[in-house]
């Protein structure tokens, strides 16, 4: 059952597992819901009737029942993790807290002329958890401005104290703001020879960098796969760091290997969700519980419907025993990985997928893609949306792009002549036009927010966030796409598709079918030459093919272009001007939309 | 229909500054490109720039780019090109176009020319 | 910079001839390349662009064809008014740039 609100001058007996420091009773149930075990906690808020060293205590409890006996207690507050609800989760925690001082290591100091540059200086630095900075209002001279970067273990300060004139809070890594590099290679035969922080057993190198980048202190991993020749050592994720944030030292070593946090690109990637099997292999762990199961499928369903389970071991039924359903081992640990990690048993393992509503809901796969052909099929491209104006007839307007549960992005220059948002309605889940009839359901928009150096389309800023009156479920057929990492600028995008309704070709008219086409994305330089009478700026991206015949059309304005990497689609551009329609041999030019994610996340993220 | 016409003729010292106008009419002159072309005495066609109307960006032919100045004032619809640092070397017939499209593309209509004379 | 070499640069022939004129770019410019004729003493006049396509007002007699580097421009049947300079420009990349032309003549 989710229980999300707090309970005040409530504390829960027993259950402690750890003791952490958080600022908020809030941040509490943040550090609770990411630990691998804690269900619920017990925060101490500041109050005279506390022993000081006792505010901002944060203990995190597990519970086989999954509840507590309760306590009356002045200033605890209580609550349980997010674990046990279904709604998106996420880490990110933008406060800024007054008059409080984070204990950590203090690895760096410097003047900075606000609280904000702090923030910024911690989020941009790769071991940076938390900050302190001293305000220019600070008793002592010398330490005015100072911006104190720290970091800890365990991402969480060693004590917390007030402090006048000081304010605190935590690097904005997890709300996607970095601008570190966002490294996704796994580089085989190589072993990282830097100090370990933790070791944790893991089935491959890709759960073992996820695990690295959701622990606080791994900068970097070696994993040793099921051949490396020292048996106690197989299966083994050595989560890493250095002074430097990089590797020392790189050894070359067969069946070794070794990668990077994806701490900068974790909002575009899963890092939580290892939704893999492992076949012939067998997680050891405490166990929770016995269910029989009929495939392995099932018994990962049961891992994740049951709140303490973390990872499984399913033994397929001997012939038929037991109505051909198989054993379903639900396990746990203390840290949430298995304990030993065993082969040729014939067991098949996986892990829990509660932990993927931590990762951002548009990592989810979607249905393969369709090849060949400029008509879409259903659900193939699920963020895009058909955006109308209802003035002076209802007509497709143009394209856009579900980002989140209540917004749109699009193009500025859609938005021309349109006076106020009750005229547009933003359609989801839609395949043909002729589907749209007067009872079709629809989003109505509560706000347009247009970029505010917008002038015109070819000038640049042609980007536009549309909030919804309404949130969005998500399904298969209407779900958000990724926003590019900003730690992602260098990646070469190869597999990349426009998409709209619009014109195929000069005066032809809006298509019911949604259109796709795969084009290439063409360098600034290339695209400068081509359209010399406009400057093409670091913030718009051009793509189309040097042959022409494919490039998006107008009444495709506003709808994205989607680049796949990784398995996952990013909203890499935004359909904004160019030659029209294929006919000459320019490329289509879009705004770029890795320049503009500081300004969507502003957006979207504003109180 | 549309037309452009061009300032007259001139003459000029080596190491002076020369300014041709370029008035567009007959179309949205802030929608198209004004492209300015050369040519020499019995030579052919070289392109030195081009200015957007409509955002005032210039684009200049490397070989002209520390000389020439391009602007262009929508408020009358005309367009100059200013050479400076004359050499006799630039005595020639001095062209501005429009482009068929708006985002380049081949010369549609072009004014009738100004001849600069530089000789000392 | 792309460099349009143009061919011949002058030719003489007789009314009701049919020209040719080619021009090769020093590397791909796709269909963007254009025609023009200059009269002299005049501003040149726009003929054909995108490889094959007239502008308006230009009389059928004129044609252009071609791709990737090879380009021909034909008059089908030469007239007296035909009498000029033509010039290759392609428009595929920044600067344009224009072949050094071919003068027609009447034999």
């Known amino acids: 059952e989710c229980v999300t609100q707090l309970l005040k001058d409530t504390c829960f007996e027993g259950g402690d597992i750890t003791t952490v420091f958080t600022p908020s009773a809030k941040y509490c149930q943040v550090v609770c819901t990411y630990h691998p075990r804690c269900l619920l906690f017990t925060f101490t808020a500041e109050s005279p009737s506390e022993d000081p060293t006792r505010w901002f205590t944060c203990v995190l409890k597990d519970s086989v029942t999954e509840t507590l006996p309760r306590v009356n207690r002045t200033a605890a507050i209580s609550g349980y993790s997010f674990k046990q609800c279904s709604h998106q989760i996420s880490a990110c925690n933008k406060d800024i807290y007054v008059d409080l001082d984070m204990k950590g290591i203090n690895y760096n100091s410097s003047v900075a002329k606000s609280a904000q540059e702090c923030q910024e200086r911690c989020t941009d630095d790769v071991h940076c958890h938390f900050f302190t900075y001293a305000t220019r209002q600070f008793p002592s001279l010398e330490h005015r401005n100072i911006c104190l970067l720290k970091h800890t273990q365990t991402g969480t300060p060693t004590r917390i104290t007030k402090l006048d004139k000081v304010v605190s809070g935590f690097s904005l890594k997890s709300c996607a703001l970095s601008n570190l590099a966002c490294i996704r290679d796994i580089f085989p035969n190589t072993v990282f020879a830097d100090s370990n922080i933790d070791s944790v057993m893991a089935p491959d190198a890709f759960v073992c960098g996820r695990i690295c980048t959701h622990h606080p202190g791994c900068l970097f991993f070696t994993f040793f796969s099921q051949e490396w020749p020292k048996e106690s050592q197989r299966n083994l994720c050595l989560l890493k760091t250095s002074e430097s944030g990089l590797p020392s030292t790189r050894i070359k070593k067969s069946k070794a290997l070794s990668g990077f946090s994806l701490q900068s690109c974790r909002h575009s990637i899963p890092v939580f969700c290892h939704s893999s099997f492992y076949h012939d292999t067998d997680f050891l762990g405490e166990e929770l519980d016995i269910v029989a199961a009929k495939s392995h499928e099932a018994c990962q369903k049961l891992c994740t419907n049951a709140v303490r389970c973390q990872f499984f071991t399913y033994t397929p039924a001997q012939a038929s025993c037991n109505e051909g359903k198989g054993k379903c081992y639900l396990k746990l640990s203390s840290n949430g990985s298995p304990t030993k990690i065993l082969h040729g048993r014939g067991g098949i393992s996986g892990y829990t997928l509660r932990l993927c509503k931590m990762d951002n809901e548009c990592t989810t796969k979607i249905k393969p893609r369709i090849v060949g052909g400029t008509a879409s099929v259903r659900g193939e491209w699920p963020w895009q949306v058909t955006l109308h104006t209802t003035s002076p007839t209802q007509r497709h307007l143009c394209g856009g792009s579900i980002i989140g549960n209540q917004w749109i992005l699009t193009a500025a220059h859609c938005f021309y002549g349109v006076e106020s948002p009750k005229i547009l309605r933003v359609y989801s889940g839609i395949l043909n036009q002729s589907e749209i009839k007067e009872d079709t359901s629809f989003f109505g928009v509560q706000e347009i927010i247009i970029h505010d150096q917008y002038k015109m389309a070819e000038s640049g800023y042609d980007i536009a966030l549309l909030k919804l009156e309404t949130t969005v479920n998500y399904t298969d057929s209407q779900r958000p796409i990724c926003l590019p990492s900003k730690g992602d600028r260098n990646v070469i995008y190869t597999d990349c598709w426009v998409t709209g309704w619009g014109y195929r070709k000069l005066r032809d008219k809006i298509q019911n079918t949604l259109q796709k086409a795969k084009i290439p994305l063409v360098t600034n330089e290339e695209c400068q030459k081509r359209y010399r009478g406009h400057k093409i700026t670091h913030k718009m991206i051009c793509a189309g093919y040097r042959e022409g015949g494919k490039d998006a059309c107008k009444g495709d304005s506003g709808g994205p272009l989607s680049c796949k990497h990784n398995e996952v689609w990013h909203l890499v551009g935004i359909t904004s001007w160019g030659e029209g329609c294929a006919q000459r041999e320019r490329p289509g030019v879009y705004t770029n939309v890795v320049e503009y994610v500081d300004w969507i996340l502003e957006k979207t993220q504003a109180v | 229909q549309v037309q452009l016409v061009q300032s007259g003729a001139e003459v000029k010292k080596p190491g002076a500054s020369v300014k041709v106008s370029c008035k567009a009419s007959?179309?949205?002159?802030?929608?198209?490109?004004i492209e300015w072309v050369g040519q020499a005495p019995g030579q052919g066609l070289e392109w030195m720039g081009v200015i957007n109307p409509g955002s005032g960006y210039t684009n200049y032919n490397e070989n002209f780019k520390d000389r020439v100045t391009m602007t262009a004032h929508t408020s009358i619809s005309t367009a100059y090109m200013e050479l400076s640092r004359l050499r006799s070397d630039d005595t020639a017939v001095y062209f501005c176009?429009?482009?068929?499209?708006?985002?380049?593309?081949?010369?549609?209509?072009w004014g009738q020319g100004t001849l600069v004379t530089v000789s000392s | 910079d792309i460099q349009m070499t143009q061919s011949p640069s002058s030719l003489s022939a007789s009314v009701g001839d049919r020209v040719t004129i080619t021009c090769k770019a020093s590397q791909s410019v796709s269909n963007d390349v254009a025609w023009y004729q200059q009269k002299p003493g005049k501003a040149p006049k726009l003929l054909i662009y995108y490889i094959s396509n007239r502008y308006t007002g230009v009389p059928s007699r004129f044609s252009g064809s071609g791709s990737g580097t090879d380009f021909t421009f034909t008059i089908s049947s030469l007239q007296p008014e035909d009498i000029a300079t033509y010039f290759c420009?392609?428009?595929?990349?920044?600067?344009?740039?224009f072949g050094q032309g071919t003068k027609l003549e009447i034999k």
């Open positions: 420009q392609q428009d595929y990349s920044s600067p344009p740039t």
């Open positions: 176009a429009r482009t068929y499209g708006k985002y380049g593309g081949a010369m549609d209509f």
């Open positions: 007959g179309y949205a002159f802030s929608n198209y490109l």
